[in-house]
Interface confidence: low
Amino acid sequence: PEPPTACREKQYLINSQCCSLCQPGQKLVSDCTEFTETECLPCGESEFLDTWNRETHCHQHKYCDPNLGLRVQQKGTSETDTICTCEEGWHCTSEACESCVLHRSCSPGFGVKQIATGVSDTICEPCPVGFFSNVSSAFEKCHPWTSCETKDLVVQQAGTNKTDVVCGPQDRLRA
């Protein structure tokens, strides 16, 4: 018969014949021949291959380097790579998550609009009129000024975006 020019899915063409690809999780040891099947070998403990392949080497699992703030989110298998994520309080610097940076804190005068996640930083917003933040925090929102009136007090010192109002007793009206 004529030698094939194309092969079926999960096969590859070599020496004018179609050989089976190795399944995910296995690497190629030797091509098939007229008399033998493709020889494949499972990937080692810290290795993987995630596609039907003819690779002679498996890929190393990603290392989640704790020095870069990384930890394992999902352990790799022979068919999947390790997925890294960031330690609590840190977030990835990219979609590939090859390193992490500390979540930003919002300075006094700014409050947290959105708390950071493993993949995005803290989003801060300036405290609008009527609100304040007197701390540097990655969690605290802007707090509303104290309402002196509801406490039967009067404003003795106006609030700012960094300080609360200061309330004091009302001046007694003389009879």
Epitope: D50, T93, E95
Partner: antibody
Framework: DVQLQESGPDRVKPSQSLSLTCTVT?????????WHWIRQFPGNKLEWMGY???????YYNPSLKSRISFTRDTSKNQFFLQLNSVTTEDTATYYC????????????WGRGTTLTVSS | QIVLTQSPAIMSASPGEKVTLTCSAS?????MHWYQQKSGTSPKRWIY???KLASGVPARFSGSGSGTSYSLTISSMEAEDAATYYC?????????FGAGTKLELK
């Protein structure tokens, strides 16, 4: 609206160093996100060169790691690309871009600056 | 590194025709992103996170796929869609782009 503008020489001799500047307006480069350099060769192939993060952390494409560096001037809201030992293969249009991680794509690109490496 | 192979490299489509561009990754990726570039301009975000349209992108565009196989589809080709489209991944470093598909109007 965030805008990025590349600037630098349009011609460099082989073996020299290349320095490009990206000036950002409308957003502070120290606030968040990652700030990237990407180049496009004459045949239109795009190559990602790496990025400098808002914290100052850098990551370089391993294919360029030995001759590339990114720095920034936060007071001018600029970040810089330096590429050493250039060859004619470095002839390309160089873009700076912002990548909003969490939105997962390059949202804003500069217009690009065209560099020719020739003697 | 993950190699992205786009096909076809060049294609022509008539107005109203359905168009599918494909992007094949050498290893599995979590998401695929697509950019449109017209001559003399920088690439524009077009489809991100595999299937989400960037703002201003007409609804005739759609994206789909998973693992190693992704596609961008135009349900009905229009003259303004003639451009080069690039796929991009960042599931693994380094970030990589496909070589692009140049889509021409027939």
């Amino acid at each position: 609206d965030v805008q990025l503008q590349e600037s630098g020489p349009d011609r460099v001799k082989p073996s020299q160093s290349l320095s490009l500047t990206c000036t950002v307006t409308g957003y502070s480069i120290t606030s968040d996100y990652s700030w990237h350099w990407i180049r496009q060769f004459p045949g239109n192939k795009l190559e990602w060169m790496g990025y400098i993060y808002s914290s100052g952390h850098t990551y370089y494409n391993p294919s360029l790691k030995s001759r590339i560096s990114f720095t920034r001037d936060t007071s001018k809201n600029q970040f810089f690309l330096q590429l050493n030992s250039v060859t004619t293969e470095d002839t390309a249009t160089y873009y700076c871009a912002i990548y909003y991680y969490g939105r997962s794509y390059f949202d804003n690109w500069g217009r690009g600056t065209t560099l020719t490496v020739s003697s | 590194q993950i190699v992205l192979t786009q096909s076809p490299a060049i294609m022509s489509a008539s107005p109203g025709e359905k168009v599918t561009l494909t992007c094949s990754a050498s290893s599995s990726v979590n998401y695929m992103h697509w950019y449109q570039q017209k001559s003399g301009t920088s690439p524009k975000r077009w489809i991100y996170d595999t299937s989400k349209l960037a703002s201003g992108v007409p609804a005739r565009f759609s994206g789909s796929g998973s693992g190693t196989s992704y596609s961008l589809t135009i349900s009905s080709m229009e003259a303004e869609d003639a451009a080069t489209y690039y796929c991009q991944q960042w599931s693994s470093n380094p970030l990589t782009f496909g070589a692009g598909t140049k889509l021409e109007l027939k």
